[in-house]
């Protein structure tokens, strides 16, 4: 009656185009056009004494320009935020994060591997202190960098004795087919190992650990 | 009752402090104070007909405020650029990159692990086509994520028969104590393996590979 | 697999990537959208106000033949 | 470490990457500093201009006892 | 390795992270919101000034029958 | 799989992380420089307007001896 034991698998582990809003209007054109169309009476009645009405035209022109400029600036930032793209070559280049300084960023999630061995509770506290949580595996596609992680590290998966299920720190249940749980040891906590394997371990046993911060 | 045991798979894979310039001035206070102090004659001479001089005081106030605002905004951006920090809690949060989409970003370097097995030349060409190069190991500190990489992957290290040295694609010589070179087979290319080990391999042998893009 | 043919020289090195970046904002999309909208509205208000302010009014002289200086038009 | 057997050719090297990155977006520090300075100067010009424009001038009434409407002061 | 004493309960879970971000720049939400608001206020001040400047007022002629040109109203 | 030894209590679970983030600036150097320049031009337009508005002009009284109030100069 064979245990299903994971064999090694061959594995593996991208700017908003700014449509340059061609503001092809010369300043003279702009102000002249506005004066001709919008301020004919003002022009004839108040130009020589520089009344407030005449001044209004200038303000209108200036503010109209400022309106276009500000909308353009904010739109650029907004569109970039919306599409998560950089307007530079290559178009597939983008920033990742934000993450704590010197953490690994992959598909807008942040990861850090910690060398020191701690039990599960200490590992969890360590991640918490850095505004993160222990590793949660939620997608083989979005987290395929985990395929090539060596060794065994605490993750945020715990066993719930009342219903026998495995549950993440956030209360969500472990999705089927995400991890191969290998129960060769007794415990209520789990270690992550390469190729999406989870090894059950006594929560009090010291192990290295992986912290994760989800930004998306 | 079978134990679920995973089989291994071979794998390839930042405010500018805004000293809130307490603009705690009601509009009326603001304009009144400026009129009293800055425009006494304007007040006495031109209030009732709302001359341009009176209007000027308002413009001055408004533009003074705008000056403060704009300098603050730009200063914040400038300081951020200067110190490479996030103005949010924690101060150590930052973005990483830019990197090609869906690459791993760590300490502003970009990495990607590729599943498909290619010889060294093909691997190099693949990285080149993505504006990157094969992995270059230049610092155990800046690249400590490489410690936990499973399996064996082509990197940009080649042997120069004329002087017997190991050299990176960019022509730089392999620094001592960076990699432990292990000559498992006869060859002029090297595979990267966990814990900063380099395994000599024939350049024509197909292997998975790691591409890298340095942004710093 | 065959070994590629002879190579006569060492690498001609690529100048690489030269993007620069450090640190990045903290605005959510809804907030950013709100800010853009607010700024747009404020600017339009200004433009609208100056048009209204610049609008010619009927002269009181048209009513009684007298010139009232700094008096509101009564038409 | 032993030296691997001779090879008749070396790999043709990829041009590599050697970019540099600092700042957010794609502004260099000098450029950003220049932009800040330019905006500050423009704003100060505006403030200065309105103060000059708002500066009281000697009334022509003090000269000849007559009120000149919309005439430049002659003192 | 010695095994730490048994634990009687399951882990007390951490509240996680909830930072949000989009775009570039380095302004915190409160600051950026304040700056935008301040800019809006500055713009509105201009609007207010335009309205004040353009607003017709009661003529001082109604007081003493004389026309005071460019004199403050005494009422 | 057998159920590991009983535990006396269950975790107080955290709702996880819900931050969101996307992208870092999207303005190229030429574009951003252009926008800043355009803003500067807008500001200078205002300055120009103020100067024009404050500039003393020749009185129309010098033309025909009459005072034309709020009438365009005819010379």
């Amino acid at each position: 009656m064979g245990w299903i034991r994971g064999r090694r698998s061959r594995h593996s582990w991208e700017m908003s185009e700014f449509h340059n809003y061609n503001l092809d209007l010369k300043k003279s054109d702009f102000s002249t056009r506005w004066q001709k169309q919008r301020c004919p009476v003002v022009k004839s009645k108040c130009r020589e004494n520089a009344s407030p009405f005449f001044f209004c035209c200038f303000i209108a022109v200036a503010m109209g320009i400022r309106f276009i400029i500000m909308v353009t600036i904010w739109s650029a930032v907004f569109l970039n935020s919306l599409f998560n793209q950089e307007v530079q070559i290559p178009l597939t280049e983008s920033y990742c994060g934000p993450c704590p300084k010197n953490w690994i960023c992959y598909k807008n999630n942040c990861y850090q591997f910690f060398d020191e061995s701690k039990n599960w509770y200490e590992s969890q506290a360590s991640c918490m202190s850095q505004n993160a949580s222990l590793l949660k595996v939620y997608s083989k596609e979005d987290q395929d960098l985990l395929k090539l992680v060596k060794s065994y590290h605490w993750m945020g998966l715990v066993h719930i004795p009342t219903n026998g299920s495995w549950q993440w720190e956030d209360g969500s249940i472990l999705s089927p087919n995400l991890l191969t749980i290998i129960e060769m040891q007794k415990g209520d906590c789990a270690l992550y190992a390469s190729s999406f394997k989870g090894y059950i371990e006594n929560c009090s046993t010291p192990n290295t650990y992986i912290c994760m911060q989800r930004t998306v | 009752m079978g134990w679920i045991r995973g089989r291994r798979s071979r794998h390839s894979w930042e405010m500018s402090e805004f000293h809130n310039y307490n603009l705690d001035l009601k509009k009326s206070d603001f304009s009144t104070r400026w009129q009293k102090q800055r425009c006494p004659v304007v007040k006495s001479k031109c209030r009732e007909n709302a001359s341009p001089f009176f209007f000027c005081c308002f413009i001055a106030v408004a533009m003074g405020i705008r000056f403060i605002i704009m300098v603050t905004i730009w200063s914040a951006v400038f300081l951020n650029s200067l110190f490479n920090q996030e103005v949010q809690i924690p101060l150590t949060e930052s973005y990483c990159g830019p990197c090609p989409k869906n690459w791993i970003c760590y300490k502003n370097n970009c990495y990607q692990f590729f599943d498909e097995s290619k010889n060294w030349y093909e691997s190099q060409a693949s990285c080149m086509s993505q504006n990157a190069s094969l992995l270059k190991v230049y610092s155990k500190e800046d690249q400590d994520l490489l410690k936990l990489v499973k399996s064996y992957h082509w990197m940009g290290l080649v042997h120069i028969p004329t002087n017997g040295s190991w050299q990176w694609e960019d022509g730089s010589i392999l620094s001592p104590n960076l990699l432990t070179i292990i000559e498992m087979q006869k060859g002029d290319c090297a595979l990267y393996a966990s814990s900063f080990k380099g395994y000599i391999e024939n350049c024509s042998t197909p292997n998975t590979y790691i591409c890298m893009q340095r942004t710093v | 697999q065959t070994t590629p043919g002879e190579r006569s020289s060492l690498p001609a090195f690529y100048p690489g990537t030269s993007g620069s970046c450090s640190g990045c904002g903290s605005l959510s999309l809804p907030l950013l959208a709100g800010l853009v909208a607010a700024d747009a509205v404020a600017s339009l208000l200004i433009v609208g106000a100056v048009f209204l302010c610049a609008r010619p009014r009927r002269s009181p002289a048209q009513e009684d033949g007298k010139v009232y200086i700094n008096m509101p038009g009564r038409g | 470490q032993t030296t691997p057997g001779e090879r008749s050719s070396l790999p043709a090297f990829y041009p590599g990457t050697s970019g540099s990155c600092s700042g957010c977006g794609s502004l260099s520090l000098p450029l950003l500093a220049g932009l800040v300075a330019a905006d500050a100067v423009a704003s100060l010009l505006i403030v200065g201009a309105v103060f000059l424009c708002a500066r009281p001038r000697r009334s022509p009434a003090q000269e000849d006892g007559k009120v000149y409407i919309n005439m430049p002061g002659r003192g | 390795q010695t095994t730490p004493g048994e634990r009687s309960s399951l882990p007390a879970f951490y509240p996680g992270t909830s930072g949000s971000c989009s775009g570039c720049g380095s302004l915190s939400l409160p600051l950026l919101a304040g700056l935008v608001a301040a800019d809006a206020v500055a713009s509105l001040l201009i609007v207010g000034a335009v309205f004040l400047c353009a607003r017709p007022r009661r003529s001082p002629a109604q007081e003493d029958g004389k026309v005071y040109i460019n004199m403050p109203g005494r009422g | 799989q057998t159920t590991p030894g009983e535990r006396s209590s269950l975790p107080a679970f955290y709702p996880g992380t819900s931050g969101s983030c996307s992208g870092c600036g999207s303005l190229s150097l030429p574009l951003l420089a252009g926008l800043v320049a355009a803003d500067a031009v807008a500001s200078l337009l205002i300055v120009g307007a103020v100067f024009l508005c404050a500039r003393p002009r020749r009185s129309p009284a010098q033309e025909d001896g009459k005072v034309y109030i709020n009438m365009p100069g005819r010379g």
Epitope: M1, R5, R8, K186, N202 | R5 | - | - | T2 | -
Partner: antibody, heavy 118, light 108 residues
Framework: EVQLVESGGGVVQPGGSLRLSCAAS????????MHWVRQAPGKGLEWVAF????????YYADSVKGRFTISRDNSKNTKYLQMNSLRAEDTAVYYC???????????WGQGTLVTVSS | QPVLTQPSSVSVAPGETARIPCGGD??????VHWYQQKPGQAPVLVIY???DRPSGIPERFFGSNSGNTATLSISRVEAGDEADYYC???????????FGGGTQLTVL
């Protein structure tokens, strides 16, 4: 510190029986699987048997199936190997070892010698 | 049952690098573990999961696993490294732990 101490070895005639014990300390015995591995004089290591942490699963080498029985008493932090129908080829030093993830043996005892001879 | 083939002996001069191979069909698909056994002593785990070193094991010990051969490498060999070295895998088909025949390392 993890300690594994084997006992119960000795000389026994072919066909005889012997019970080996392994006392464990320094770790949570009830949480880990345990192995018996033997080494004939001048020979290499040969895996003999494995028992899961809760005793629910036991595995044996083909050469000892039906003759040897592995068991454990978690309350006593001890595991056992009951050897029946002993043969001359069973003569070896028997090592007790702690399992890790069902893959490798991370701690070993010093061994106890079992001699099957007439 | 997989057969792990090891040479009975390997000799190396002090300061040199010793390489002890362990052959087996598709061995690269399995985790290979290595044990050192000095005369009269119990075996000690020196490498697990192909190339991981337990705490306390010198950095001179390296493991690799590729193709049909796993290799234990010991750089800058010292006299104290003289011992028998065994490779081991878990046979998931037969639920057995399999050891190689062992290699005696001699430091010349």
């Amino acid at each position: 510190e993890v300690q594994l101490v084997e006992s119960g070895g000795g000389v026994v005639q072919p066909g005889g029986s012997l019970r080996l014990s392994c006392a464990a300390s320094g770790f949570t015995f009830s949480s880990y699987g345990m192995h018996w591995v033997r080494q004939a004089p001048g020979k290499g290591l040969e895996w003999v048997a494995f028992i899961r942490y809760d005793g629910s699963n036991k595995y044996y080498a083909d050469s000892v199936k039906g003759r040897f029985t592995i068991s454990r008493d978690n309350s006593k932090n001890t595991k056992y190997l009951q050897m029946n129908s002993l043969r001359a080829e069973d003569t070896a030093v028997y090592y007790c070892a702690k399992d890790r993830f069902g893959y490798y043996l991370d701690y070993w005892g010093q061994g106890t010698l079992v001699t099957v001879s007439s | 049952q997989p057969v792990l083939t090891q040479p009975s002996s390997v000799s190396v001069a002090p300061g040199e690098t010793a390489r002890i191979p362990c052959g087996g069909d598709d061995i690269e698909t399995k985790s290979v573990h290595w044990y050192q056994q000095k005369p009269g002593q119990a075996p000690v785990l020196v490498i697990y999961d192909d190339d991981d070193r337990p705490s306390g094991i010198p950095e001179r010990f390296f493991g690799s696993n590729s193709g049909n051969t796993a290799t234990l490498s010991i750089s800058r060999v010292e006299a104290g490294d003289e011992a028998d070295y065994y490779c081991q895998v878990w046979d998931d088909n037969n639920d057995e732990w399999v050891f190689g025949g062992g290699t005696q390392l001699t430091v010349l």
